[in-house]
């Protein structure tokens, strides 16, 4: 989990001759704000829905009134940071779209009048952890300035946001193959309940045992480069899992929706549809008139002069919604069978299939355990002539659609602390214990007797890859 | 490829002490903790104990007693595993193998070293 | 320590045959791994956490149990299952072995 940050630096006339007209006048005062949508993956058809990583409305600027015979200069910028937080691995390639939008101030009939000023968009490779990435778009006449970038949130850490940190009881010490998180010193990294060898530079996993690959990367362990022309083929960050998936908490846990709001998972991440009134990525924000520009991708909004009057969002082709904020969705028809996950690329449906089973709509099954659903990722098991699900970290029950406790079954030994993660259960070990489990007691060579580590021996930690 | 490559076959006389090496290589050896097993001639295994090698934090199997010390050598992916004061019935197979923990923290050891004779005679 | 008990310790079959091996720990181990050992040979890595199939292990074998009681099922023998399997516990310290049961040609 973690939050993209951009940071609106200049909007006003780019250089050379042309240079447009101020769009605020003494007789129409203006003030600016910005949208901003992020997709995963380096391709426009990499995102499933229209935001997928998530989208964030700026405040309005200040109130700008052009003077007369002056140039246009750069106009003022609203206060602070952008901000969309991301509740999934920082996919290490993504797609933007900044819009300007110009709130007009005069006196016409309705309020205010919004209008789009600007429309910029781009790909970028960019890390979580890393430094402000500076960068300068333009549309038109007009020139952007901004700086971006990614940042975990606390306990996660790394490239990805996929790696998680906690706190050591020794210093100096961490476990094999485990640095000390910078900055947080005194803490090291949890481990990875990756794929063995699954590249820590270039894959990650939200899941135990599996090995996603960042965009431009590809293999089963995310080793091998793709070439630049398929880095732009019609594909997210790849997965190449074996073993048990394993998912953490759905992001719809919770419900993270508002005043009302009904939450429905996307591939990456989760989607609020919100009552009318209400819009923003939860649904929060509130009173809502058509003088606050409602109405997303283009709709055309009628009535609601006054917030306790809805409004109406008459959406273009293509978008739907109250606040014309989802594309239409034509894999709600459902049309992948026994399971398969529906990708609309916008010229076509495809079905990425279950293990078990194939064909354009996954309708042929190719082995007798997949006709036993087992829930939230379990893996059919057969044994003695009988299926059954062996569950996923997190569930249980005959089909595993019971939500369990990871920490119930206590599987930290010897008084270590068992925290459930996304990417898997990790146990903190008292002092004097080693392993994963914290199942070994740790003995000083010569004194294998002894049943603990004596004061100050920081013990050993789990291995990083699972 | 993952592979463990032990040291060769060694006779030790009542007493001495024998140190077989375990070179890793395919992955990287400080990731997975690496344990030593032994198998004396028609019998079942024997955990030895377990070393982390990033670390050098190890835990032995109460029955050796203190005659067990498991060392690595980091910079060139080996581990060590050194028993003294050896007696015939140690006459066995030692194996290196390395620990793997699955999603829910199972334990198991996912790829072993060919074995070394280690035979005890007077 | 705790102690893993195999049944049976040998047994002969013939090829296409359904075996089942059974092990028994003394105490609850949450868990176990499967083993099969060849002659001269190192053991190898059939199956973990009860029931999960090591990468490269045919379907033919199973795993299944909880607790204290665990099954390795060969659901159809061919030439090349003819060795010596082994369960092991890795839940409790100091980690422990089966005996062993040795599958030979009937």
């Known amino acids: 989990a973690g939050v993209f940050e951009l940071q609106i630096h200049s909007f006003g006339p780019g250089p050379g001759p042309g240079a447009p007209r101020s769009p605020c006048s003494a007789r129409l005062p203006c003030r600016l704000f910005f949208r901003v949508c992020l997709k995963p993956g380096l391709s426009e058809e990499a995102a499933e829905s229209p935001c997928a990583l998530g989208a964030a409305l700026s405040a309005r600027g200040p109130v700008y009134t052009e003077q007369p015979g002056a140039p246009a200069p750069d106009l003022p910028l609203p206060d602070g940071l952008l901000q969309v937080p991301f509740r999934d691995a920082w996919p290490g390639t993504f797609s933007f779209i900044i819009e300007t939008w110009r709130e007009e101030l005069g006196d016409q009939i309705g309020g205010p009048a919004w209008s789009l000023l600007a429309r910029v968009a781009g790909r970028r490779r960019l890390a979580a952890g890393g430094p402000w990435a500076r960068d300068i778009q333009r549309a038109g006449a007009w020139e952007l300035r901004f700086s971006y970038r990614a940042r975990c949130e606390p306990p996660a850490v790394g490239t990805a946001c996929t790696r998680l940190c906690r706190p050591r009881s020794a210093p100096s010490r961490c476990g094999p193959g485990l640095r000390p998180c910078a900055p947080l010193e005194d803490e090291c990294e949890a481990p990875l309940v990756c794929r063995a060898g699954c590249s820590p530079e270039h894959g990650f996993c939200e899941q135990p045992g599996e090995c996603r690959c960042l965009e431009g990367w590809t293999g089963p362990l995310c080793t091998v480069p793709v070439s630049t022309s398929s880095c732009l083929s019609p594909r997210g960050p790849s997965s190449a899992t074996t073993g048990c998936l394993v998912p953490g908490p759905g992001p719809c846990d919770g419900n993270p929706c508002a005043n009302g709001g009904s939450c429905s998972e996307t591939p990456r991440s989760f989607e609020c549809t919100c009552p009318r009134g209400f819009y923003g990525l939860r649904c929060e924000v509130s009173g809502v008139t058509c003088a606050d520009g409602p109405c997303f991708n283009g709709g055309l909004c009628v009535g609601g002069a006054d917030p306790d009057s809805a409004y109406i969002c008459h959406c273009p082709p293509g978008f739907q919604g109250s606040n014309c904020e989802k594309r239409v969705d034509r894999c709600s028809l459902q049309p992948c069978r026994n399971g398969g996950l529906c990708l609309d690329l916008g010229h076509a449906l495809r079905c990425r299939c279950r293990a078990g089973f194939a064909g354009p709509r996954c309708e042929h099954d190719l082995d007798d355990c997949a006709g036993r659903a087992c829930a939230n990722g379990g893996t059919c098991v057969e044994g003695g002539g009988a299926h059954r699900c062996s569950c996923a970290l997190g569930f249980g029950g005959r089909d595993c659609r019971e939500r369990a406790d990871p920490c119930a079954a206590r599987p930290c030994a010897h008084g270590g602390r068992c925290y459930a993660h996304f990417s898997g259960l990790v146990c903190a070990c008292a002092p004097g214990y080693m392993g994963a489990r914290c199942e070994f007691p740790v003995h000083p060579d010569g004194a294998s007797a002894l049943p603990a580590a004596p004061p100050g021996l920081r013990p050993g930690d789990p291995q990083r890859y699972l | 490829e993952v592979r463990l490559v032990q040291s060769g076959a060694e006779v030790k006389k009542p007493g001495a002490s024998v140190k077989v090496s375990c070179k890793a290589s395919?992955?990287?050896?400080?990731?997975?903790?690496m344990n030593w097993v032994r198998q004396a001639p028609g019998q079942s295994l024997e955990w030895m104990g377990i070393?982390?090698?990033?670390?050098?934090?190890?835990s032995y199997n109460q029955k050796f007693r203190g005659r067990v010390t498991l060392t690595v050598d980091k910079s060139a992916s080996t581990a060590y595993m050194e028993l003294s004061s050896l007696r015939s019935e140690d006459t066995a197979v030692y194996y290196c193998?390395?620990?793997?923990?699955?999603?829910?923290?199972?334990?198991?050891?996912?790829?072993w070293g060919q074995g070394t004779t280690v035979t005890v005679s007077s | 320590d705790i102690q893993m008990t195999q049944s049976p310790s040998s047994l002969s079959a013939s090829v296409g045959d359904r075996v089942t091996i059974t092990c028994k720990a003394s105490?609850?181990?949450?868990?176990v791994s499967w083993y099969q050992q060849k002659p001269g040979k190192a053991p190898k890595l059939l199956i973990y956490?009860?029931?999960n199939r090591y990468t490269g292990v045919p379907s033919r074998f199973s795993g299944s149990g909880s607790g204290t009681d665990f099954t390795l099922t060969i659901s159809s023998l061919q030439p090349e299952d003819f060795a010596t399997y082994y369960c092991?516990?890795?839940?409790?310290?100091?980690?422990?072995f089966g005996q062993g049961t040795k599958l030979e040609i009937k």
């Open positions: 956490g009860a029931s």
């Open positions: 395919g992955y990287t050896f400080t990731d997975y903790y």
């Open positions: 092991g516990q890795s839940y409790s310290y100091p980690l422990t």
């Open positions: 105490e609850n181990v949450g868990y």
């Open positions: 070393i982390n090698p990033y670390t050098g934090d190890t």
């Open positions: 193998a390395r620990y793997h923990y699955g999603p829910h923290l199972e334990g198991y050891f996912d790829v």
